[in-house]
């Protein structure tokens, strides 16, 4: 799915009002120094692509995130604010149902959610000019950004 045409401000609002708090709840009891963010994103559509992948795709050692509260709210936000997103997710929903057997919080899942928090931070506040084309429509060329 191409996230370019999503309403980023509405998704950001949904994240800050509820999803962020659910992620914090999931991570509660985990030391803030425990995980190093290794997944990054370069613009808002890219951030949403990475967020979708980490939230809904089962990975080795963490198969169960898709049924967590933050994941369901993420799915709802994307369905509402990304045109045509719901239609692309029918097959993914079937895969999710198959993964619904056990709800276990593993260290790998905690690490994955830590990565998600980092991706959401960059979605909320893109840093560089190359992130601007779809994010900052009206004054992007007034920004002077430096990339090292």
């Amino acid at each position: 799915y191409d996230f370019t045409n999503c309403d980023f401000e509405k998704i950001k609002a949904a994240y800050l009002s509820t999803i962020s708090k659910d992620l914090i709840t999931y991570m509660s009891g985990t030391k803030s120094t425990e995980f190093n963010n290794t997944v990054s994103c370069s613009n808002r559509p890219h951030c949403l692509t990475e967020i979708q992948s980490l939230t809904f795709n089962p990975t080795a050692g963490c198969a169960s995130l898709a049924k967590e509260m933050f994941a369901m709210k993420t799915k709802a936000a994307l369905a509402i604010w990304c045109p045509g997103y719901s239609e692309t997710q029918i097959n993914a929903t079937q895969a999710m149902k198959k993964a619904r057997k056990s709800k276990v919080t593993t260290n790998k899942c905690l690490e994955q959610v830590s990565q998600l928090q980092g991706l959401w931070r960059r979605f909320n506040r893109p840093l560089l000019k190359q992130q601007g084309s779809s994010d900052y429509k009206d004054d992007d060329d007034k920004h002077h950004h430096h990339h090292h």
Epitope: N36, N37, W120, R121, R125, L127, H148
Partner: antibody, heavy 119, light 107 residues
Framework: EVQLVQSGAEVKKPGSSVKVSCKAS????????IEWVRQAPGQGLEWMGV????????NYNENFKGRVTITADKSTSTAYMELSSLRSEDTAVYYC????????????WGQGTTVTVSS | DIVMTQSPDSLAVSLGERATINCKAS??????VTWYQQKPGQSPKLLIY???NHYTGVPDRFSGSGSGTDFTLTISSLQAEDVAVYYC?????????FGQGTKLEIK
């Protein structure tokens, strides 16, 4: 508990440079943006720039006309702000701050470093 | 640059009374507004992020509202420890900019 500890006060001559350090502890340094903000005596807050220590991407306030350079050393969890071509108007308290968990605010601040520019 | 203009510059309110500080942006900043409190000789402290969200440990008497260009910080019942300078900040566009500050005192 996250802590940002800054280097000590500096007195500098006009035209010289100053480099202020900001050492982070209690969190994963490379996961959060580090901001630099200054405050002239009796004045408000002025944002200078930001660095992502994870990939050293930066963004500067162009009002400083290229005089600001922000760097980070992951091995020591330390960010640096260097300001060149100093003038008397640069006399201020310089703060480093860390972005919060949502990326929408600065939740931890250093204690501030006083830089005095005087001939 | 987006200019953030606070009003009033200073405000004197009686203990237990309501204090209201306004912040106006020169162009829309959506909901990307943060409020900070700074006491004399101290670093700023985060109070409210994304217009109305309380930072951890901030008392309920502080609240934020607004969207677009007009924002308000309200202290419902002023306490002695609330004497400080309050700043709004936008993070919608680079460079990030702050209001000039509002000094809150006890009447």
């Amino acid at each position: 508990e996250v802590q940002l500890v800054q280097s000590g006060a500096e007195v500098k001559k006009p035209g010289s440079s100053v480099k202020v350090s900001c050492k982070a502890s209690g969190g994963t340094f490379s996961n959060y943006l580090i901001e630099w903000v200054r405050q002239a005596p009796g004045q408000g807050l002025e944002w200078m720039g930001v660095i992502d220590p994870g990939n050293v991407d930066t963004n500067y306030n162009e009002n400083f006309k290229g005089r600001v350079t922000i760097t980070a050393d992951k091995s020591t969890s330390t960010a640096y702000m260097e300001l060149s071509s100093l003038r008397s108007e640069d006399t201020a308290v310089y703060y480093c701050a860390r972005e919060d968990n949502t990326g929408t605010a600065f939740d931890y601040w250093g204690q501030g470093t006083t830089v005095t520019v005087s001939s | 640059d987006i200019v953030m203009t606070q009003s009033p510059d200073s405000l004197a309110v009686s203990l237990g009374e309501r204090a209201t500080i306004n912040c106006k942006a020169s162009q829309s900043v959506s909901s990307d507004v943060t409020w900070y409190q700074q006491k004399p000789g101290q670093s700023p402290k985060l109070l409210i992020y994304y217009v109305s969200n309380h930072y951890t440990g901030v008392p309920d008497r502080f609240s934020g509202s607004g969207s677009g260009t007009d924002f308000t910080l309200t202290i419902s019942s002023l306490q002695a420890e609330d004497v400080a300078v309050y700043y709004c900040q936008q993070h919608h566009r680079f460079p990030l900019t702050f209001g000039q500050g509002t000094k809150l005192e006890i009447k």
